[in-house]
């Protein structure tokens, strides 16, 4: 019967007794940077090319001569997970292996860099189809490792890496912390984060998604027909590399940004038990388990968006946090969040020719996060319209006044340390969908965008008294581009998007002594592109 | 091993006259930084990746590496260039004493230097 992990990543429409999704990644070359591999194993024989690249440190304190089968074990298993005949994800994908880890599974940053350069050189000498690079390894945070990954990604290569097995914040490790790399955490058959002895999968904002990573059956180097079950974030990353190969085979022209957005879009949402993660990491960690698209039809009709969290600002009074979108993505909205509730809002700024989301800490605050909503929208042109604090009881308002521009997000920023309560509650005037409304003492910023066929609407869910969480979701066919709190009083911790749902968090009412007059609303801006819908209909 | 060292000594002698007049100071206002792994057991002191500024011409990597070797030799230190990067980042990998870091950080075109560290199968 089908192994649990292959079943988990397979949409129901493919599920039979066998895992046989169409187009097995045959147009894609997957580079594996790992230990040596047993290329004559029946699972991978004929689909693996062992390059002559080797850059490994000497084994330490070993008691006997190197035995191939023992040195090949890690790499062979992963090669099998990516493209093995029986237990592989992308059975048609070709594999090229580079040896950067020794028999003890140890390598160096420098050796891996030389390996990445070898791949780039090969790509320049002989350009082929789409390339996926699998890095099932981790070291401490490394500026140079991350920079090299960024360069390779900008050259059109898709990099997939293990989040790490340290039960820790993935941002403390490389290449897991590189924003351009697709970083994968591990879950088990119960959709729980994987525990590995006293440690387990890494987590946090640097993880893009999770994938099966416990009790994964794959090729064993003990013999050419042997199999073994293994666990780890390497195994999880190998699943995503396989899924990426499948997607790129179906749509070879996909950019890294498009591929990442699709991986997120087709993932199973909200199935992971977040209680396993440290409390402060739960909101930052994506609750996504990778899966193949339900069919090979082009998903171009969809307006894809994802949420990107910044690093924590730190507690100093003037501290700020910045969230950035990937190279080919557009920042459509910006929000902020603080666990203490002490923040001074957020705004969209230009930085190096790109829009970024900056959040501001307040005096006595423990720090803030900036949260960017990053979307794929062809031919988009955005600007920010700002209204200074109105001072009047009506609150501050700003709208998109340029012809053809629609509102994609609202941000507010204030200089005062503590916004007073807002009585009576401010609710949006009817018939003005292109308007942002906020506290009278705050500057309000409207993100206004123009793109062919782009239409947006505001959806609001208000409650008369503060609750710990208020949510509002976009309907099917619409994508959440903006999420903000209304009116942004002091008990609001912030707003952020989770998939297609806008979440507004408030302080625990029991501890703040809030009055029932302090209303709070979650405001979602939901968009779709008629242009993309038409384009996909023409394709089909 | 001896052959490599022999070649290296010849190279240094050939470069001395060319390099002697060069200042150790970096270009005006530039400050290169040094980075190392926060996890102490994973550090690999003695091997360093010298990363040059983004816009650096590819021939500059070799030239900077040679300059470092020459200046190190003048101070009585042996260095070994293990690899020169061209296709991803401009820079080079060097085996040298940590005593030379201050000198290396002052070289023209240097953006930052990172001490090598371990990575592990996951």
């Amino acid at each position: 019967s089908i192994p649990w992990n292959l079943e988990r990543i397979t949409p129901a429409r493919y599920r039979a007794d066998e895992y046989q999704p169409p187009k097995g990644g045959s147009l894609v070359e997957v580079y594996l940077l790992d230990t040596s591999i047993q290329s004559d194993h029946r699972e991978i024989e004929g689909r693996v090319m062992v390059t002559d690249f080797e850059s490994v440190p000497e084994e330490d304190g070993t008691r006997f001569h190197r035995q191939a089968s023992k040195c090949d074990s890690h790499g062979t298993h992963l090669a099998g997970v990516v493209s093995g005949r029986d237990a592989g994800v992308a059975k048609g994908a070709g594999l090229r292996s580079l040896r950067v880890l020794n028999c003890q599974g140890k390598g160096t940053v420098s050796g891996t860099l030389i390996g990445l350069e070898f791949i780039r050189k090969s790509q320049l000498v002989q350009p082929v189809g789409p390339l996926v690079v699998l890095l099932p390894l981790a070291g401490g945070y490394s500026r140079v490792f991350n920079a090299a990954c960024q360069r390779l990604a900008r050259a059109g290569v898709v990099l997939v890496t293990a989040a790490g097995n340290f039960r820790d914040d993935a941002c403390l490790y490389s290449p897991a912390s590189a924003p351009e790399v697709i970083t994968v955490g591990a879950t088990n058959a119960q959709d729980q984060p994987v525990t590995l002895g006293t440690l387990g999968t890494n987590f946090g904002r640097c993880v893009d998604l999770f994938a099966p990573g416990e009790d994964i059956i794959g090729a064993s180097s003990d013999c050419s027909t042997c199999f073994v079950s293994r666990s780890g974030t390497s195994q999880a990353a190998a699943h995503v590399a396989g899924i990426a190969a499948m997607m790129l085979s179906a749509e070879p022209e996909l950019t890294l940004a498009e591929l990442r957005q699709r991986l997120i879009h087709f993932s199973a949402k909200d199935v992971i038990n977040e209680a396993w993660f440290p409390e402060d990491q739960r909101v930052l960690t994506p609750n996504l388990v990778a899966a193949l698209p339900p069919s090979t039809h082009r998903a171009g009709w969809q307006l894809f968006c994802r949420t990107v969290w910044s690093a924590h600002s730190g507690p100093t009074r003037m501290a700020t946090a910045v969230a950035r979108c990937a190279q080919d993505e557009e920042l459509l909205s910006c929000s902020s969040f603080s666990r203490s509730g002490k923040r001074r809002g957020e705004r969209i700024e230009a930085q190096g020719g790109k829009r970024v989301c900056r959040a501001h800490n307040a005096f006595g605050g423990e720090g803030v996060y900036a949260i960017a909503r990053c979307c794929l929208l062809p031919q988009v042109n955005c600007s920010v319209h700002t209204a200074p604090p109105a001072g009047a009881s009506m609150g501050t308002r700003v709208h998109c006044h340029q012809q053809g521009h629609v509102l994609t997000g609202c941000s507010s920023h204030w200089e005062v340390e503590d916004l007073g309560t807002h009585k009576p509650p401010v609710l949006r005037p009817r018939g003005q969908p292109n308007q942002c409304v906020g506290h009278r003492e705050a500057s309000i910023h409207a993100s206004c965008c123009h793109a062919p066929g782009l239409e947006c609407k505001v959806k609001e869910h208000g409650i008369p008294a503060p609750q710990e969480q208020v949510i509002v979701a976009c309907e099917d066919g619409w994508t959440l581009t903006g999420c903000s709190a209304l009116p942004g009083t002091s008990h609001v911790l912030g707003a952020y998007a989770v998939d297609n749902t806008c979440v507004v968090r408030s302080r625990d009412v029991s501890t703040t002594g809030s009055t029932s007059e302090e209303a709070v609303a979650a405001v979602a801006i939901c968009c779709r592109s008629r242009h993309l819908v038409q384009a996909s209909q023409e394709l089909q | 091993q001896e052959d490599e060292d022999g070649d290296y000594e010849e190279l240094v002698l050939a470069l001395r006259s060319e390099e002697d007049g060069l200042a150790d100071a970096p270009e005006h206002g530039a400050t290169a930084t040094f980075h190392r792994c926060a996890k102490d057991p994973w550090r690999l002191p003695g091997t360093y990746v010298v990363v040059l500024k983004e816009e650096t011409h590819r021939s500059q990597s070799e030239r900077t590496a040679r300059r470092l070797q020459a200046q190190a030799a003048r101070r009585g230190y042996l260095t070994k260039i293990l690899h020169v990067f061209h296709h991803l980042l401009p820079g080079f990998l060097v085996k040298m004493s940590g005593d030379l870091l201050e000198l290396a950080l002052k070289l023209p075109h240097v953006d930052y230097i990172e001490e090598d560290s371990s990575v592990f199968a996951q």
Epitope: K70, C71, T198 | D40, P41, F120, A121
Partner: antibody, heavy 127, light 112 residues
Framework: EVQLVESGGGLVQPGRSLRLSCTAS????????MHWVRQTPGKGLEWVSG????????NYADSVKGRFTISRDNAQNSLYLQMNSLRAEDTALYFC????????????????????WGQGTTVTVSS | DIVMTQTPLSLSVTPGQPASISCRSS???????????LYWYLQKPGQPPQLLIY???NRFSGVPDRFSGSGSGTDFTLKISRVEAEDVGLYYC?????????FGGGTKVEIK
């Protein structure tokens, strides 16, 4: 439920051999270092040997080095201890034990701890 | 090899009363990774040892919170805040900073 079951113990004459087996269930066997530990009334608990997941890294106590061989078969979820040239002082209750630490080759895990033990199998070396 | 010395050899405790066992290593068990590799086990009569505490002070899953570990470097202590009848048996400390793994001689805990 994680379980380890030892077998193969018995009475054997000095100089002869014995092979102990340990069958594991309830966990992904290949993810962990495995160990043999013995217990004698006189010497208490004594670590005998340990083996990494892919058998690359193998260690022995000095008292058994050259006489005992540890091995594993991940496909069968089994751990073995081949004991040759047995001596009277090898008489003990032999436990198979799972390591607490997820093992990836030796990678970043240099340290060990034993979290699950089998019930043990008795080896008596006597003429 | 690292020598582990446990005191006392035996301990007789009234139920509900606290108990404390000491363990001293012949060299520091602090690793450069910041962790200290000291473990505590309980072996009940007729059973294999069971893990109580790992890395000095972390309780293993399922271990009651009346058990706690402390110490650093070379000196370590296992405390039982209120001894219960089921806590009788032999208590061992073990170091794993260096192979071979070595155990203390054991402390026998019995109920008065």
């Amino acid at each position: 439920e994680v379980q380890l079951v030892e077998s193969g113990g018995g009475l054997v004459q000095p100089g002869r051999s014995l092979r102990l087996s340990c069958t594991a269930s309830g966990f992904t066997f290949a993810d962990y270092v495995m160990h043999w530990v013995r217990q004698t009334p006189g010497k208490g608990l004594e670590w005998v040997s340990g083996i990494s997941w892919n058998s690359y890294s193998i260690n022995y106590a000095d008292s058994v080095k050259g006489r005992f061989t540890i091995s594993r078969d991940n496909a069968q979820n089994s751990l073995y201890l081949q004991m040759n040239s047995l001596r009277a002082e090898d008489t003990a209750l032999y436990f198979c034990a799972k390591d607490i630490t997820y093992d990836l080759l030796t990678g970043y895990n240099y340290n060990y701890g034993l979290d699950v033990w089998g019930q043990g199998t008795t080896v008596t070396v006597s003429s | 090899d690292i020598v582990m010395t446990q005191t006392p050899l035996s301990l007789s405790v009234t139920p509900g009363q606290p108990a404390s066992i000491s363990c001293r290593s012949s060299q520091s068990l602090l690793h450069s990774d910041g962790k200290t590799y000291l473990y505590w086990y309980l072996q009940k009569p007729g059973q294999p040892p069971q893990l109580l505490i790992y890395e000095v002070s972390n309780r293993f899953s399922g271990v009651p919170d009346r058990f706690s570990g402390s110490g650093s470097g070379t000196d370590f202590t296992l405390k039982i805040s209120r001894v219960e009848a089921e806590d009788v048996g032999l208590y061992y400390c073990m170091q794993s900073i260096q192979l071979p793994l070595t155990f203390g001689g054991g402390t026998k805990v019995e109920i008065k």
